[in-house]
C-alpha cells in the first residue's frame, strides 16, 4: 500500500485554514469535489462538496467550510474559517467521478488548532472583533446525506496550505453572521 503523506499546519482558534488541492485539469475540471475528514482507523467522511458538475470559481459554503474550484488552474481551494480546537484532525481533498471511485488528492492535511490569541500577520484575528475574508456571495452544495455512497481510492496530485489571505473581505463581529448552517427539515 502507498504510504500516505501529511502536511502539518498549526493554527490558532479564530484563524482560517486555506488549502489548495491540485488536480489534472482536463480530467477532473468539472468533476464534483469534496473535503473529507479522516476519522480514526482510516475512515474518511465527507464534510462538504462542490456542486455537480463543479462550477468554475463558484464559492460554495457549508457551515464554516468554503470550497472554490478553479478549473483554469486545476485546483480546489478549501477554506475553514473561524477555526476551533475541535477542528483539529486529518483532512483530505477527493474528486468524485461516478461511476468510478473517488480519487484522493495528496497530501493530506494534519490540522492542529490551539487556543490562544495570535497577533501574527494573516491571523485574521484581533482583540475586539474577528475579521474573516469571505466571498460575499456563496451557495451551499447539496452534499449527499442518504444516497448511494462510494469509497475512496488514491491519486497522485499534491495539496498546499497556508493561512488565508483571500481577495475580498467582510468584517464581522459575530461568527454566526458568516455561518450558513444547512437547512434542516
Amino acid at each position: 500500500a502507498t504510504k500516505l503523506t501529511e502536511e502539518k499546519y498549526e493554527l490558532k482558534e479564530g484563524q482560517t485554514l486555506d488549502v489548495k488541492c491540485d488536480y489534472t485539469l482536463e480530467k477532473f475540471a468539472s468533476s464534483q469535489k469534496a473535503w473529507q475528514i479522516i476519522r480514526d482507523g482510516e475512515m474518511p467522511k465527507t464534510l462538504a462538496c462542490t456542486e455537480r458538475p463543479s462550477k468554475n470559481s463558484h464559492p460554495v459554503q457549508v457551515g464554516r467550510i468554503i470550497l472554490e474550484d478553479y478549473h483554469d488552474h486545476g485546483l480546489l481551494r478549501v477554506r475553514m474559517v473561524n477555526l476551533q480546537v475541535e477542528d483539529s484532525g486529518l483532512y483530505q481533498c477527493v474528486i468524485y467521478q461516478p461511476p468510478k471511485e473517488p480519487h484522493m488528492l495528496f497530501d493530506r492535511i494534519r490540522l492542529v488548532v490551539t487556543k490562544g490569541f495570535s497577533g501574527t500577520p494573516g491571523s485574521n484575528e484581533n482583540s475586539t472583533q474577528n475579521v474573516y475574508k469571505i466571498p460575499p456571495t456563496t451557495t451551499k452544495a447539496l452534499c449527499p446525506l442518504y444516497t448511494s455512497p462510494r469509497t475512496v481510492t488514491q491519486a497522485p496530485p499534491k495539496s498546499t496550505a497556508d493561512v488565508s489571505t483571500p481577495d475580498s473581505e467582510i468584517n464581522l463581529t459575530n461568527v454566526t453572521d458568516i455561518i450558513r448552517v444547512p437547512v434542516f427539515n
Epitope: G41, M43, V62, P149, T151, F184
Partner: antibody, heavy 122, light 112 residues
Framework: QVQLVQSGAEVKKPGASVKVSCKAS????????MHWVRQAPGQGLEWMGI????????SYAQKFQGRVTMTRDTSTSTVYMELSSLRSEDTAVYYC???????????????WGQGTMVTVSS | DIVMTQSPLSLPVTPGEPASISCRSS???????????LDWYLQKPGQSPQLLIY???NRASGVPDRFSGSGSGTDFTLKISRVEAEDVGVYYC?????????FGGGTKVEIK
C-alpha cells in the same frame, strides 16, 4: 432488500472467545462502514468499534482494545467480531449496524442486524 | 469521551398527546460543516434499534412526520407531536462527533 443477518446465540465459558458474524445483502458491501454495538441485559447501547469493509481498516473503543478483533470477508459480504478473554460482564446482545460510507455526510446507523445473544457463564 | 445525558429516564405518555425527550452532550456536536452529529434511535420491545433522526434534525426514511429533532451544539430535543401506541420503547440519542461513538442512557416511553 437491504439487510444484515447475524449468526445465532452463543454460550461461552469465562476466558473463552466468541466470533459473531454479520452477513450483508441488498447493497454494495464495500461502500458502507460497519459498526458493532452491544447491549447488556436491561442496559443501554455501547459502541464497540468500526470496520471499513473496503480496506479492512478498523477502529475500536478503548474499552475493548486488545480484546476485540473485527474482520471482513468481501467474497461473502460478511463482517466478523471476535471478542476474547470473555467475562460475565460481556453477556449481552451484540449488534452489527451499517453506517453510510465515506462519500456521505451522515454517520447514522440506518440498518441494524437482528442481534446475537452471547452468554458468558461458568 | 463525549458523555451523553438523556432526560427523563422514564416518560409515561397519553396517546394523542405530545412528548419530548432531552439529550445533552458534554462537548459540542456541531461540526465545521454546520451539521450536528447527533442521531436518535428507537428500540421497540424485543427489537433492534431503528434510526429516527440523523444529523440532529433530519428524519430517516419511513419515519412518520410526528417525530422531529431539534437543537444544536450540546442541547438536543426529540419531539413526538402526537404519541401513538406503537411509539412505545426506549429512545436513545447517539453522538458521532468524536470517537468513541457514545449513546445516552435511554428514555423509556410507555403508555399511561
Amino acid at each position: 432488500q437491504v439487510q444484515l443477518v447475524q449468526s445465532g446465540a452463543e454460550v461461552k465459558k469465562p476466558g473463552a472467545s466468541v466470533k459473531v458474524s454479520c452477513k450483508a445483502s441488498g447493497y454494495t458491501f464495500t461502500s458502507y462502514y460497519m459498526h458493532w454495538v452491544r447491549q447488556a441485559p436491561g442496559q443501554g447501547l455501547e459502541w464497540m468499534g468500526i470496520i471499513n469493509p473496503s480496506g479492512g481498516s478498523t477502529s475500536y473503543a478503548q474499552k475493548f482494545q486488545g480484546r476485540v478483533t473485527m474482520t471482513r470477508d468481501t467474497s461473502t459480504s460478511t463482517v466478523y467480531m471476535e471478542l476474547s478473554s470473555l467475562r460475565s460482564e460481556d453477556t449481552a446482545v451484540y449488534y452489527c449496524a451499517r453506517e453510510a460510507g465515506s462519500w456521505l455526510i451522515s454517520t447514522a446507523f440506518d440498518i441494524w442486524g437482528q442481534g446475537t445473544m452471547v452468554t458468558v457463564s461458568s | 469521551d463525549i458523555v451523553m445525558t438523556q432526560s427523563p429516564l422514564s416518560l409515561p405518555v397519553t396517546p394523542g398527546e405530545p412528548a419530548s425527550i432531552s439529550c445533552r452532550s458534554s462537548q459540542s456536536l456541531l461540526h465545521s460543516n454546520g451539521y450536528n452529529y447527533l442521531d436518535w434511535y428507537l428500540q421497540k420491545p424485543g427489537q433492534s434499534p431503528q434510526l429516527l433522526i440523523y444529523l440532529g434534525s433530519n428524519r430517516a426514511s419511513g419515519v412518520p412526520d410526528r417525530f422531529s429533532g431539534s437543537g444544536s451544539g450540546t442541547d438536543f430535543t426529540l419531539k413526538i407531536s402526537r404519541v401513538e401506541a406503537e411509539d412505545v420503547g426506549v429512545y436513545y440519542c447517539m453522538q458521532a462527533r468524536g470517537t468513541p461513538w457514545t449513546f445516552g442512557g435511554g428514555t423509556k416511553v410507555e403508555i399511561k
